[in-house]
């Protein structure tokens, strides 16, 4: 348990036996647009009942679609996938050494919680203290894509700004994606205020995710540095 009372969940969903993944035998790009940058990207999925199970499936499909457009590997774009309700459940960790297709498969398996509460404060705390506790790739950009469709109770949001500021100190960009009429616009505006890079996308429903996908991927990708050219021997 975290000092702040956060219960640390297991970091993996049931997956098939790990196959040896050789970084250099990468899978071919699936789309014309392909982000090859130095990026640590965390997907944070709202697991509240404000999204129906069908809508949650569309949300997952959006995450999988985004992952298809990233050059996922330990050298380039590392991804984590977390579903949050009153706690947080990590399905993929940044250091997971699996093929991109396997990571997409795991992302598609995220279970629908349909809980009464999805605490953005808890998941940002989790992101701060668990995912980015140690910065092991200082040269990469760090981004948390906060997919939010609900509002946490006020009692849970007391330390919200503190966690957003903590993430800012660790140079973690938070990009909120508000989905539907119940998304917490007040929290979205607070996140935006903390840093100019914290650009929000506000959508009226999950149906708009596909339309906005390329713009969101482009925005994330533009925030990340390109890999320096290989140094030539003298």
């Amino acid at each position: 348990q975290e000092p702040g009372g956060l219960v640390v969940p297991p970091t993996d969903a049931p997956v098939s036996p790990t196959t040896l993944y050789v970084e250099d035998i990468s899978e071919p790009p699936l789309h014309d647009f392909y982000c090859s940058r130095l990026l640590d990207l965390v997907f944070l999925l709202d697991g509240s009942s404000r999204l129906s199970e069908a809508e949650f499936e569309v949300l997952k499909a959006f995450v999988v679609d985004m992952m298809e457009r990233l050059r996922i590997s330990q050298k380039w774009v590392r991804v984590a996938v977390v579903e949050y309700h009153d706690g947080s459940h990590a399905y993929i960790g940044l250091k997971d050494r699996k093929r991109p297709s396997e990571l997409r498969r795991i992302a598609s398996q995220v279970k629908y919680a349909g809980s009464q509460v999805a605490s953005t404060s808890e998941v940002l705390k989790y992101t701060l203290f668990q995912i980015f506790s140690k910065i092991d790739r200082p040269e990469a950009s760090r981004i948390a894509l906060l997919l939010m469709a609900s509002q946490e109770p006020q009692r849970m949001s007391r330390n919200f700004v503190r966690y957003v500021q903590g993430l800012k100190k660790k140079k973690v960009i938070v990009i909120p994606v508000g989905i539907g009429p119940h998304a917490n616009l007040k929290q979205i505006r607070l996140i935006e205020k903390q840093a100019p890079e914290n650009k929000a996308f506000v959508l009226s429903s999950v149906d708009e995710l596909e339309q906005q996908r390329d713009e969101i991927v482009s925005y994330l990708c533009d925030l990340a540095p390109e890999a320096p050219p290989p140094t030539l021997p003298p």
Epitope: S49, S52, E53, A54, E55, E57, V58, K60, A61, V64, R105, S108, Q109, V110, K111, Y112, G114
Partner: nanobody, 122 residues
């Protein structure tokens, strides 16, 4: 092993309606309809979730097709209205054991019915 049996297909004129049924031999989580037009790939039509009864329908049939289920009968229905010749296909019912793959991909679904032919004449 879940068994799925579709019924309700047939020949109908453009603008007409049909209701397809799919009876499952056991409890299912999500139940989906796919279709395969002649000479084309199998494509997603609609899905319904047992947890909350929520549904997704492909953009190409939105407003014309509705998916529903009767939990007591373990049966899912596809109500098709304003049918067009382009809707001509073999319609398949499918369900999955777990959630692996996106809702619209055939690879997600473990169990399939034998299919029922729908022909829409102009």
């Amino acid at each position: 092993q879940v068994q799925l049996v579709e019924s309700g297909g047939g020949l109908v004129q453009a603008g007409g309606s049909l209701r397809l049924s799919c009876a499952a031999s056991g409890r299912t989580k999500d139940m989906a309809w796919f279709r395969q037009p002649p000479g084309k790939e199998r494509e997603f039509v609609a899905v319904i979730y047992s947890s909350d009864g929520s549904t997704l329908v492909a953009a190409s049939v939105k407003g014309r097709f509705t998916i529903s289920r009767d939990n007591a009968k373990n049966t899912v229905y596809l109500q098709m209205t304003s049918l067009k010749p382009a809707d001509t296909a073999v319609y398949y019912c499918a369900t999955s054991r777990g959630y692996s793959g996106t809702y619209y991909s055939t690879s997600r679904y473990d169990y399939w019915g034998q299919g029922t032919q729908v022909t829409v004449s102009s």
